[in-house]
């Protein structure tokens, strides 16, 4: 399977909400012994590899924000902790999964990574990530709403091992 990032750049004004999205593509094994661990974290482009460093999002780690379920099942993060931080991650039946961030500030700017790990018999078998940039703008040049920029076809299917 692969992870696609429909948008590579989100440009938002302060105070707005945004939903960053990734999509699971390709054949997904729906066997009983297969589960998917999906999560989000912040990172940097890095001098070596994008998404190799895992930084928290609003002080919540990738463990705090993870979804753990089989195949294309729907799921949501545990509400209390994430919602106290203005965050919610979710996954639908079609392989889309997302993180919603409320009341954005400049401090939310940076690179965001989604990570999918396929787990068979309790062992990590395959992991892929996708990356996207969030720019939260202040001042007179800030847009009135979030503007999203589609990934190039090459970028949108990120199959780099995390």
């Amino acid at each position: 399977f692969k992870v696609a990032t429909p948008y590579s750049l989100y440009v938002c004004p302060e105070g707005q909400n945004v939903t960053l999205t990734c999509r699971l593509l390709g054949p997904v094994d729906k066997g009983h012994d297969v589960t998917f661990y999906k999560t989000w974290y912040r990172s940097s482009r890095g001098e070596v590899q994008t998404c190799s460093e895992r930084r928290p999002i609003r002080n919540l780690t990738f463990q705090d924000l993870h979804l753990h379920h089989g195949g294309h099942q729907a799921a949501n993060t545990s509400h209390d902790l994430a919602q106290r931080h203005g965050l919610e991650s979710a996954s639908d039946h079609h392989g889309n999964f997302s993180i919603t961030m409320r009341n954005l500030t400049l401090l939310d700017s940076g690179l965001y990574c989604c990570l999918v790990v396929e787990i068979r018999h309790h062992h990590s078998e395959h992991r892929v990530h996708g990356a996207m940039e969030l720019q939260v703008q202040t001042g007179k040049d800030a847009p009135s709403n979030c503007v999203v920029y589609p990934s190039s076809s090459q970028d949108s299917e990120n199959i780099t091992a995390a």
Epitope: R42, S44, R45, P56, R58, N59, L107, E133, Q135, T138
Partner: antibody, heavy 121, light 111 residues
């Protein structure tokens, strides 16, 4: 080891533009961090002016927004400050500095040595 | 703008004693549990040097004689025991809201 070095004219006439260059060695400005300009006035007051992020996104101090532009040349690993319509109030030591960007902590961890700029006719 | 009020403006301390510098922000500098408050030292003719970030984290290479504390709007920098090399200006700085702002500075001298 990452190092930053400011360069530019030490004397600028009122109403003209001030242009400074920060040359970064030991780290690519497109890899991570935000790259800032900060100035220190006579009497020691420090003022943050603005930054350009590793991805090229700029944020400016609202008080300077109408006069400031920060740009970069990634091939030379340099970033630049342009301040238009200067007055004697812009006389200061100008520093470029790196700050952590896109994480839980935001702070200036590497500074250039500074360059003194006097605005005078 | 968040106004950073530093006190005292100058401080004379005997070698080996404790120096305490305070900084008050005009509004909270908390960001989801992190205090976005820094402390810098500056010696004459040199740029500021980071000492403490996020209120209490000591920057790598900085002696553990330097301690930062506080949350919300009230912060302090403690230096103990004070050494001759600590003679400098000290600045607090917030990065919670643009424009990022600095305190007016505290000049540390030896008695």
């Amino acid at each position: 080891e990452v190092q930053l070095q400011e360069s530019g004219p030490g004397l600028v006439k009122p109403s003209q533009s001030l242009s400074l260059t920060c040359t970064v060695t030991g780290y690519s400005i497109t890899s991570d961090y935000a790259w800032n300009w900060i100035r220190q006035f006579p009497g020691n007051r420090l003022e943050w002016m603005g930054f350009i992020s590793y991805s090229g996104f700029t944020t400016y101090s609202p008080s300077l927004e109408s006069r400031i532009s920060i740009t970069r040349d990634t091939s030379k690993n340099q970033f630049f400050l342009q301040l238009i319509s200067v007055t004697t109030e812009d006389t200061a030591t100008y520093y470029c500095a790196r700050n952590h960007y896109g994480g839980s902590y935001w702070y200036f961890d590497v500074w250039g040595a500074g360059t003194s700029v006097t605005v005078s006719s | 703008d968040i106004v950073m009020t530093q006190s005292p403006g100058s401080l004379a301390v005997s070698l080996g004693q404790r120096a305490t510098i305070s900084c008050r922000a005009s509004e909270s500098v908390e960001y989801y549990g992190t205090s976005l408050m820094q402390w810098y030292l500056q010696k004459p003719g040199q740029p500021p040097k980071l000492l403490i970030y996020a209120a209490s984290n000591v920057e790598s290479g900085v002696p553990d004689r330097f301690r930062g504390s506080g949350s919300g709007t009230d912060f302090s920098l403690n230096i103990h025991p004070v050494e001759e090399d600590d003679i400098a200006m000290y600045f607090c700085q917030q990065s919670r809201k643009v424009p990022w702002t600095f305190g007016g500075g505290t000049k540390l001298e030896i008695k």
